[in-house]
Interface confidence: low
């Protein structure tokens, strides 16, 4: 059976297409190509006579067509108007005609698209933004990309107008993009330049850093305030409710206890008209807000009961602290044999008795913090009693 095949089926505008013929019969007079799905002399493109090997152009010939002896038809520099059906009529020697119809589709080479927006400076949680991919073209698929990824499923994202328009409902600061639109057809694809949104937002609740609350007298107090905001926030500082300065950073050298108090950072966004504050408590004190873990040492950890004495020492680098001792969860000293010395840093047990065996630890503390050492184990042994007569039992 006579058939035709388009190579390629989808053709880019300006390119060429070859209408191939398969199963061409023997003993032919000639053949003729027509535009359309039927034989119509008014739409004849070209006729070819085998005997004379002569091609005769028809009414529908544009000068871009070439017919080959094998009946294939080459059309060059195709336009979108060339899209459609083409019919080949073969005139056999027995004057019986055969026909075959094929088709192809011409698509334009797509231009680089661009994105238009109805609002490039939206306000967070308030405005919606509609992006439109230009130009509008037929037989084109519109795709959208956010941050180089295809659109996520989200109730805030809506596509309309044949996917040519992307609407962001109630934009957030995370919707800055970049946004790209891509147009596709079977023969080409092109992507726009990225577009970003300048989302106005904030300020958020400011953060004051560093997070330290406690400072030693004589230190420099350097506080920095930051609030997420677009455009960037304007900052001001208040100390105990009194305005100090309009800067993002506050520096007070050589602080004293009088600098203790509440430090307020005020952040303002002149575009959104919003402002937020954060208050940080600063406490200037000689006391260490975090007492380091003390170390506990024993003059010996295995002693002989009723004979040996032992000294336990609690070591710390912190100043302005107190020390207390514990044994089996009981506060020490608990007997006259236990003595504390050197500001409670040393616990002496003299003499050691069986009931002194067990776990000891010390704790260092000041009015705002405390820490305790790892436990230390004291073992108490008793020597075996000597035989009265010095002889082994018989």
């Amino acid at each position: 059976q006579l058939t035709t095949e388009s190579m390629p089926f989808n053709v880019a505008e300006g390119k060429e297409v070859l209408l191939l013929v398969h199963n061409l019969p023997q003993q032919l007079f000639g053949y003729s190509w027509y535009k359309g799905e039927r034989v119509d002399g008014n739409r004849q493109i070209v006729g070819y006579a085998i005997g004379t090997q002569q091609a005769t152009p028809g009414p529908a010939n544009s000068g871009r067509e070439t017919i080959y002896p094998n009946a294939s038809l080459l059309i060059q520099n195709v336009t979108q108007n060339d899209t459609g059906f083409y019919t080949l009529q073969v005139i056999k020697s027995d004057l019986v005609n055969e026909e075959a119809t094929g088709q192809f589709h011409v698509y334009p080479e797509l231009p680089k698209p661009s994105i238009s927006s109805n609002n490039s400076n939206p306000v967070e949680d308030k405005d919606a933004v509609a992006f439109t991919c230009e130009p509008e073209t037929q037989d084109t698929t519109y795709l959208w990309w956010i941050n180089n990824q295809s659109l996520p499923v989200s109730p805030r994202l809506q596509l309309s107008n044949g996917n040519r328009t992307l609407t962001l409902l109630s934009v957030t600061r995370n919707d800055t993009g970049p946004y790209e639109c891509e147009i596709q057809n079977p023969v080409s694809a092109n992507r726009s330049d990225p577009v970003t949104l300048n989302v106005t937002y904030g300020p958020d609740t400011p953060t004051i850093s560093p997070s330290d609350t406690y400072y030693r007298p004589g230190a420099n107090l350097s506080l920095s305030c930051y609030a997420a905001s677009n455009p960037p926030a304007q900052y001001s500082w208040l100390i105990n409710g009194t305005f100090q300065q309009s800067t993002q950073e506050l520096f007070i050298p050589n602080i004293t206890v009088n600098n203790s108090g509440s430090y307020t950072c005020h952040a303002n966004n002149s575009v959104t008209g919003c402002n937020r504050t954060t208050v940080k408590t600063i406490i200037v004190t000689e006391l260490s807000p975090v007492v380091a873990k003390p170390q506990i040492k024993a003059s010996k950890t295995t002693v002989t009961g009723d004979k040996d004495s032992v000294n336990l020492t609690c070591s710390t680098n912190d100043t302005g602290i107190s020390i207390r001792w514990f044994f089996k969860n009981q506060s020490l000293p608990s007997s006259e044999r236990m003595k504390l010395s050197q500001g409670n840093t040393t616990l002496s047990i003299n003499p050691v008795k069986r009931e002194d065996a067990g776990t000891y630890w010390c704790e260092v503390f000041n009015p705002i913090s405390k820490n305790q050492s790892d436990p230390i184990m004291l073992n108490v042994n008793y020597n075996a009693l000597p035989q009265e007569n010095g002889l082994s039992p018989g």
Partner: antibody
Framework: EVQLLESGGGLVQPGGSLRLSCAAS????????MSWVRQAPGKGLEWVAT????????YYPDSVKGRFTISRDNSKNTLYLQMNSLKAEDTAMYYC??????????????WGQGTLVTVSS | EIVLTQSPATLSLSPGERATLSCRAN?????MYWYQQKPGQAPRPWIY???NRATGVPARFSGSGSGTDYTLTISSLEPEDFAVYYC?????????FGQGTKLEIK
């Protein structure tokens, strides 16, 4: 200026229930922890309940635990106190209070004017 | 729970005098807070974080203390200072209040 307006107080019999409301305005309600504090006639202040800013966490003293429930609707800027199995000793002025700063919320920085709850037969 | 004991229960002084109100805890607390309450009114925050005056509180008021002993001092009493003052802690749960000190005109 921060505004806290309590409502819902009244006379109720022992064993009865009452729901107090506190309408908040002039501040970002969802940023702040909120509490109820009560004061029996001629007596001192007693903490009743606290709820975190997002409403996830709640705290009660033993005296009301299991009987009172604090809740909030951040979309309506409203704090609630559901009081069940009321006793005579629950008679008091109930104050709605907003906590202090975000970084140190352990005090009651703003108070409403209170709503009086009387439990009596 | 931490119990706060305020003393004296009533303090009778004249305007211009110095007032010292005490709040003692049965266990060490990190900070103390003070509230002022006048008859028929809600409490008002007065001192926070032991020594910081709340908004609108005059400079004649000062707070101090540490550990278990805290003090609210009024350097020179004005007529509007006569009220009940409560201390409050929240170092550990539950938060507790003192029973109050009534400052009255002598």
């Amino acid at each position: 200026e921060v505004q806290l307006l309590e409502s819902g107080g009244g006379l109720v019999q022992p064993g009865g229930s009452l729901r107090l409301s506190c309408a908040a305005s002039e501040f970002t309600f969802s940023d702040h922890a909120m509490s109820w504090v009560r004061q029996a006639p001629g007596k001192g202040l007693e903490w009743v309940a606290t709820i975190s800013s997002g409403g996830t966490y709640t705290y009660y003293p033993d005296s009301v635990k299991g009987r009172f429930t604090i809740s909030r609707d951040n979309s309506k800027n409203t704090l609630y106190l559901q009081m069940n199995s009321l006793k005579a000793e629950d008679t008091a002025m109930y104050y709605c209070a907003r906590h202090g700063f975000d970084y140190f919320p352990y005090w009651f920085a703003h108070w409403g004017q209170g709503t009086l709850v009387t439990v009596s037969s | 729970e931490i119990v706060l004991t305020q003393s004296p229960a009533t303090l009778s002084l004249s305007p211009g005098e110095r007032a010292t109100l005490s709040c003692r805890a049965n266990s060490a607390v990190s900070y103390m807070y003070w509230y002022q309450q006048k008859p028929g009114q809600a409490p008002r925050p007065w001192i926070y974080l032991t020594s910081n005056r709340a908004t609108g509180v005059p400079a004649r008021f000062s707070g101090s203390g540490s550990g278990t002993d805290y003090t609210l001092t009024i350097s020179s009493l004005e007529p509007e200072d006569f009220a009940v003052y409560y201390c409050q802690q929240w170092t550990s749960n539950p938060p507790t209040f003192g029973q109050g000190t009534k400052l009255e005109i002598k």
